[in-house]
Interface confidence: low
């Protein structure tokens, strides 16, 4: 019996087609993805093949103005329109709190939303009961397939799930649910979830009875053969894990941003054993036309976005200096503003020993693309912020050794004075450079804001200590020459849309007045 | 003949039990102090020992919502209930002016209230006559003991005693009163007062005829042996001073906030000479039960307070360090929070040339009277803020010349290290001190946030420039020795109530996390 699994993950509000790098579509003839194009491909496969499941492995929420404005209603609406069969909860589904998940998505979705390792307690337990499930048994042709969900146990550090949801260890929580499915004579089981490729592989290895793992969170690109675009494969598609009980378990993920549609064909024997698996992600490029009815619907929903982007978010009473003349050469107040917003967006006070899990921010000055003039009555709009941060990136959470950070700051000024983008803006960091010293040895002082403390204060960076840092995904991926970050990072969790982070902060603060305050000095 | 002296000082409205750091009690099983617990211990000692005096060395007034609401009536009521034998006036007893001392306390207290170095003049002299005394002779068993009071001569700089009270030098004023007691054949004399440990020791050394000194004001903790809590002893208990006429004079103080009950046993010979002294402060921890009748009375009085100020204003995820150990010695994050709130409350963007009319804040560390513990779910209430800023002052706008500000910062550290209140917390100012230099020449760097600029940044202070500064009315009026501000200010506009400024800021910010960020440095 053959099953076709179509899968997406980490779509992050890319409802409209995008450029090849998943930023805003500029030249339509070269654009990719988007739900209208996805629907064309899904429908084509549904018509051609008998047993098809369309699954999403979480993080539909967060990433563009679509989410900012529609707050998840757009996810429910268009996933319903595409007739998804199931979705697993990702960490970003909690970005607007539990209420922001329940009302727009859980109550509106016409497909099951799954997570076996999230347990509700207190008053929330009855309120959320039945709105998400640990698993769902789906009829597919003449057979049934069990889908069991999971979500990163790090979610309390990555989003805002509140105090009434407990995130258990994935493997510990999945095993009893899979066992239950077995007792229900379900012999074909897919683990669909959002914990990252390493955890996906562990689930394949450790959870008895899981036949296929469809994952997300780590934006992993797998491909067999010559990849069709710029993404470099982390392994073959599917990635085969040998389980502890000797089975070959295919693990898949489909990069991110709706650029690809994961396409996995599984052959099961009559007892539900996987006897073959093959496929590849399908690049959703302009050779696939956008479905006209979905496109028309997108255009209708689009109108509200255009109005939103010109509305006032808040005010500035100072010039927000995002000029390259400043931000690539010295501390600039636009850099300070953005870093302050990045930290503010990552407040997760979960432990008495730590005032927060993260206190540091770095931001390549070259990623700041425009100033904002305060002389327009101080008004700041989404449109203004889109000029400052036009690349549609995310502000991510990484774990790095102190020694890696030191290398990053040396790289920041290794060719200082040439107006290059790698000059770092900071938050929760005090750095002093001596440019008279040779490149690679110019950082003479690097103090960082403690986290394991009740009163935040600055201490010298320790080379062997592991630090959490918020930074643009561009830097996490080694951009602007920060290869050491990419090569040496110990953990990487994708975060919220860059503009959204800053706009939320400005809306919260109402009036802003960031200063140049001595975070970066030259001795 | 043996005398037991039980003593408190600097209780500062801690009528209810508190956390170990004397902030609001969070976990009752670990709480300390409070009048109900104090009464249990006092009664236990009164039952067990024949000759007991219960004395208070001043500063019952000011510190929590109890004083804000009841304005001293609570002090009289509960000190009467505990049957104090005498109290010396502290500087804070004048915080609501002389009227605020006379009506609720002096007229209602059933015990003598003492100060030998405060002399009333003008119309006040007849009004206050007999309501406080220079000394009182108390019968104790078959003997009599003279208690002579004194109050910090700095009180006019620290509180609001008005113009009709003269505060004389303690030693000069005490000697004739002690001499008078000697002529009355009182041969056992206790000096009970509120001028700080250094003055207490001087009194022991210089005032002939004083047998014991029971002090306050400097929150001095003395202990013999291993201290029972977090306070680090400044010396042994009692601290023995050899007087100029060769006697060994015990000097005691009992920290502050009602956390300890001072317990001193003195043995006198038949001529009134001290032949032995020993004891220790008793930590009033949860091993001592709260007296049920006093506790019931506290609960009855409490009702009025709960309505007043127990609603959450916002949250903190950091410890708001308002301890005198921090705020009188170095940059503290409570000072930063308050200054940031003061600037935020004074945003008036009226001119393109100026991002704001004012960018600077100074705040005497001594005006920060309590920390706020974040471990109470982060909740901050008006009540919490009233303990931090209990003086009901205002945050005012002044115009000063740069030279005046420089003098103020020199004054800030002119006698650094003595836990005096004039150490300045700041906002919009970066100051560097070199304490190896002589007083008056210790400010080696003073940079201030520009106002006539579109991007706020720090520039060196200019001596001849006129600056606007936000500061407590206490400083504008020359308090804590800042005479230069009072004398040289060019303009003074009174501002908003201090707690209100901070509470509004916290409500606006919702979640706060002020850091120690290098505003104040020592080279």
């Amino acid at each position: 019996w053959e099953l076709t699994i179509l899968h997406t993950n980490d779509v992050h509000s890319r409802l409209e087609q995008t450029s090849e790098d998943s930023s805003k579509c500029v030249n339509a003839s070269r654009c990719m993805g988007g739900v209208a194009r996805l629907f064309t491909k899904v429908q084509q496969i549904r018509r051609a093949e008998p047993n098809v499941l369309l699954l999403d492995a979480g993080d539909q929420y967060q990433g563009t103005i679509w989410f900012t404005v529609y707050k998840g209603a757009e996810v429910a609406h268009f996933m319903n329109a595409l007739r998804y069969d199931a979705m697993a909860l990702g960490n970003h589904e909690f970005d607007n709190g539990v209420e922001g998940l329940i009302e727009p998505l859980l109550k509106e979705a016409k497909f099951p939303i799954l997570s076996a390792n999230i347990k509700a307690k207190g008053p929330l337990a009855s309120q959320i009961s039945g709105l998400y499930l640990p698993y769902k048994v789906l009829p597919v042709g003449d057979e049934v397939v069990g889908i069991v969900g999971y979500t990163s146990k790090e979610t309390p550090f990555l989003s805002n799930p509140g105090t009434n949801l407990v995130f258990e260890d994935e493997i510990t929580a999945l095993q009893p649910e899979v066992d239950k499915l077995k007792t229900l004579n379900v012999n074909k089981i897919i683990a669909l979830g959002h914990s990252g490729f390493e955890t996906d592989k562990l689930i394949a290895q450790k959870v008895r009875g899981v036949d296929v793992v469809v994952g997300g969170h780590s934006n992993t690109f797998l491909y067999t053969g010559n990849p069709p675009s710029k993404e470099v494969p982390a392994g073959k598609y599917p990635f085969i894990v040998t389980s502890d009980d000797g089975r070959k378990v295919p693990v898949v993920q489909a990069y991110a941003f709706g650029k690809y549609l994961g396409y996995l064909k599984i052959e099961f024997d009559e007892r539900g054993n996987v006897i073959s698996s093959h496929g590849n992600p399908i690049l959703l490029n302009s050779s696939i036309p956008e479905d006209p009815s979905i496109k028309a619907d997108i255009n209708k929903w689009r109108i509200k976005l255009d109005n939103y982007s010109t509305q006032e978010l808040g005010k500035t009473i100072v010039y927000l200096d995002g000029s390259s003349q400043s931000c690539r050469f010295r501390e600039c107040n636009m850099g300070n503003l953005i870093c302050d917003a990045m930290i503010n967006n990552n407040l997760r006070h979960a432990d008495e020993m730590f005032w927060n899990h993260v206190s540091m921010c770095i931001l390549n000055g070259g990623g700041i693309r425009s100033p904002i003039d305060e002389r327009n009555n101080g008004t700041i709009t989404w449109e203004n912020l889109a000029a400052v941060l036009p690349f549609g990136g995310t502000f991510d959470l990484v774990q790095l050794k102190g020694s890696t950070l030191k290398k990053a700051f040396e790289h920041s000024v290794h060719r200082y004075g040439q107006s290059t983008g790698e000059f770092l803006q900071v938050g929760g960091i005090h750095v002093v450079y001596d440019l008279s010293r040779k490149p690679g040895d110019r950082v003479v002082k690097l103090d960082v804001l403690c986290t394991k403390c009740r009163v935040p204060s600055y201490d010298p960076l320790k080379m062997d200590e592991i630090y959490k840092v918020i930074l643009p995904n561009f830097l996490a991926n080694g951009g602007d020459g920060f290869q050491m970050i990419k090569d040496e990072l110990l953990r990487h969790d994708s975060g919220d849309q860059d503009i959204n982070v800053v706009s939320t902060y400005i809306s919260k603060m109402k009036v802003i007045y960031p200063a140049v305050e001595g975070r970066i000095k030259f001795s | 003949w043996e005398l037991t002296i039980l003593h408190t000082n600097d209780v500062h409205s801690r009528l209810e039990q508190t956390s170990e750091d004397s902030s609001k009690c969070v976990n009752a099983s670990r709480c300390m102090g409070g009048v109900a617990r104090l009464f249990t211990k006092v009664q236990q000692i009164r039952r067990a020992e024949p000759n007991v005096l219960l004395l208070d060395a001043g500063d019952q007034y000011q510190g929590t919502i109890w004083f804000t609401v009841y304005k001293g009536a609570e002090v009289a009521h509960f000190m009467n209930a505990l049957r104090y034998d005498a109290m010396a006036l502290g500087n804070h007893e004048f915080d609501n002016g002389v009227e605020g001392l006379i009506e609720p306390l002096l007229k209602e207290a059933k015990f003598p209230i003492l100060s030998a170095n405060i002399k009333a003049k003008g119309p006040l002299a007849s009004q206050i006559s007999g309501l406080y005394l220079p000394y009182k002779v108390l019968p104790v068993g078959d003997e009599v003991v003279g208690i002579v009071g004194y109050t910090s001569k700095e009180t006019p700089f620290l509180s609001n005693p008005g113009t009709n009270l003269v505060f004389e030098d303690e030693i000069t004023a005490l000697q004739p009163e002690v001499d008078k007691l000697k002529t009355l054949n009182v041969n056992k004399i206790i000096a009970l007062g509120h001028s700080g440990f250094e003055t207490d020791k001087l009194i022991a050394q210089k005032v002939r005829g004083v047998d014991v000194v029971v002090g306050g004001h400097s929150n001095t903790f003395l202990y013999t042996g291993n201290p029972p809590s977090k306070e680090v002893p400044a010396g042994k208990y009692p601290f023995i001073v050899t007087s100029d006429d060769g006697r060994k004079v015990p000097v005691v103080q009992a920290y502050a906030f009602g956390k300890y009950l001072g317990y001193l046993k003195i043995e006198f010979d038949e001529r009134g000479n001290v032949i032995s002294s020993h004891g220790n402060p008793i930590l009033l921890n949860s091993s001592i039960p709260e007296d049920p009748s006093i506790k019931a009375d506290i609960n009855k009085w409490r009702i009025k307070l709960d309505n007043y100020s127990t609603q959450e204003l916002g949250k903190t995820i950091v410890y708001l360090d308002g301890s005198s150990q921090s705020c009188r010695f170095r940059e503290c994050n409570m000072g930063n929070l308050i200054c940031d709130a003061m600037i935020n409350n004074n945003l008036r963007h009226a001119d393109e040339m100026f991002w704001n009319h004012v960018s600077m804040c100074i705040l005497n560390g001594g005006g920060i009277r309590s920390p706020i513990d974040e471990r109470n779910n982060g909740t901050i209430t008006w009540e919490n803020l009233a303990a931090v800023l209990p003086f009901g002052g205002t945050f005012d706008l002044v115009q000063l010349k740069g030279s005046t500000l420089k003098k103020a910062f020199e004054h800030s550290v002119h006698r650094y290290g003595q836990s005096t209140g004039e150490f300045l917390q700041v906002g919009g100012i970066h100051v560097v001190y070199d304490l190896s230099r002589k007083p008056g020449d210790r400010v080696v760097k003073l940079d201030v946030l520009c106002t006539k600029c579109r991007v706020p940044s720090y520039d060196p202070l200019k001596m001849d420039e006129i600056y606007k500064v936000i500061l407590p009315n206490f400083l504008a009026n020359g308090g804590d020795g800042f005479q230069m501000i009072k004398d040289e200010l060019l303009r003074h506009d009174s501002g908003d109530q201090d707690i209100n400024v901070v509470s509004t800021y916290i409500s606006k910010m919702k979640v706060i996390y002020p850091a120690v960020e290098g505003r104040i440095k020592f080279s």
Epitope: - | M353, I466, L490
Partner: antibody
Framework: EIQLQQSGPELVKPGASVKVSCKAS????????MYWVKQSHGKSLEWIGY????????SYNQKFKGKATLTVDKSSSTAYMHLNSLTSEDSAVYYC?????????????WGQGTLVTVSA | DAVMTQTPKFLLVSAGDRVTITCKAS??????VAWYQQKPGQSPKLLIY???NRYTGVPDRFTGSGYGTDFTFTISTVQAEDLAVYFC????????FGAGTKLELK
């Protein structure tokens, strides 16, 4: 050097109007209010009003409302005062003045004055 | 508007004299008071602002004091070049000048 250069003397007939100019140099014109002050012969000084060159906002002494109209031309850094329905009472020296700083109206910089004589 | 009553109208002085001029405000104007000197045929010159602060370049023989309603302007030792008309001005409540005091040689 900060300078305020006023237009020359005017002799006008009763009922006519006159426009006095004040050209500023040596500072950012739009950053400071421009004040106008009247001094009748042998008399004290009277404040007429001021204009904010940045946005053209004006404030007038009640006594001169309807008599004086203040305008600016930002491109030439020039302030103007138009006086209408002139009578002999309007004969005076008129000064433009700029403040010391821009918090208060302490007039540190003055034009040389323009004598307006109203005579039949 | 606060009215500024300036006295005296005239002062006969000799070189070296000490001269005091007073201005009384009809209501409190805090310390929002300035003093000006005007010589014949010239524009006024700012001498004192904020009641007691000497403007740049003004000799220290000129001093001002006062707060609220009563203000004093003093020339400690009159010199020949000080013969002029002196005006007070407030800008706390609208903006008004005193009537002026003329210094003349005896």
């Amino acid at each position: 050097e900060i300078q305020l250069q006023q237009s020359g003397p005017e002799l006008v007939k009763p009922g006519a109007s006159v426009k006095v100019s004040c050209k500023a140099s040596g500072y950012a014109f739009t950053s400071y209010n421009m004040y106008w002050v009247k001094q009748s012969h042998g008399k004290s000084l009277e404040w007429i009003g001021y204009i904010d060159p940045y946005n053209g906002g004006t404030s007038y002494n009640q006594k001169f409302k309807g008599k004086a109209t203040l305008t600016v031309d930002k491109s030439s850094s020039t302030a103007y005062m138009h006086l209408n329905s002139l009578t002999s009472e309007d004969s005076a020296v008129y000064y433009c003045a700029r403040g010391y700083g821009n918090y208060k109206a302490w007039f540190a910089y003055w034009g040389q004055g323009t004598l307006v004589t109203v005579s039949a | 508007d606060a009215v500024m009553t300036q006295t005296p109208k005239f002062l006969l002085v000799s070189a070296g004299d000490r001269v005091t001029i007073t201005c009384k405000a009809s209501q409190s104007v805090t310390n929002d008071v300035a003093w000006y000197q005007q010589k014949p045929g010239q524009s006024p010159k700012l001498l004192i602002y904020y009641a007691s602060n000497r403007y740049t370049g003004v000799p220290d023989r000129f001093t001002g004091s006062g707060y609220g309603t009563d203000f004093t302007f003093t020339i400690s030792t009159v010199q020949a070049e000080d013969l002029a008309v002196y005006f007070c001005q407030q800008d706390y409540s609208s903006l008004t000048f005193g009537a002026g005091t003329k210094l003349e040689l005896k």
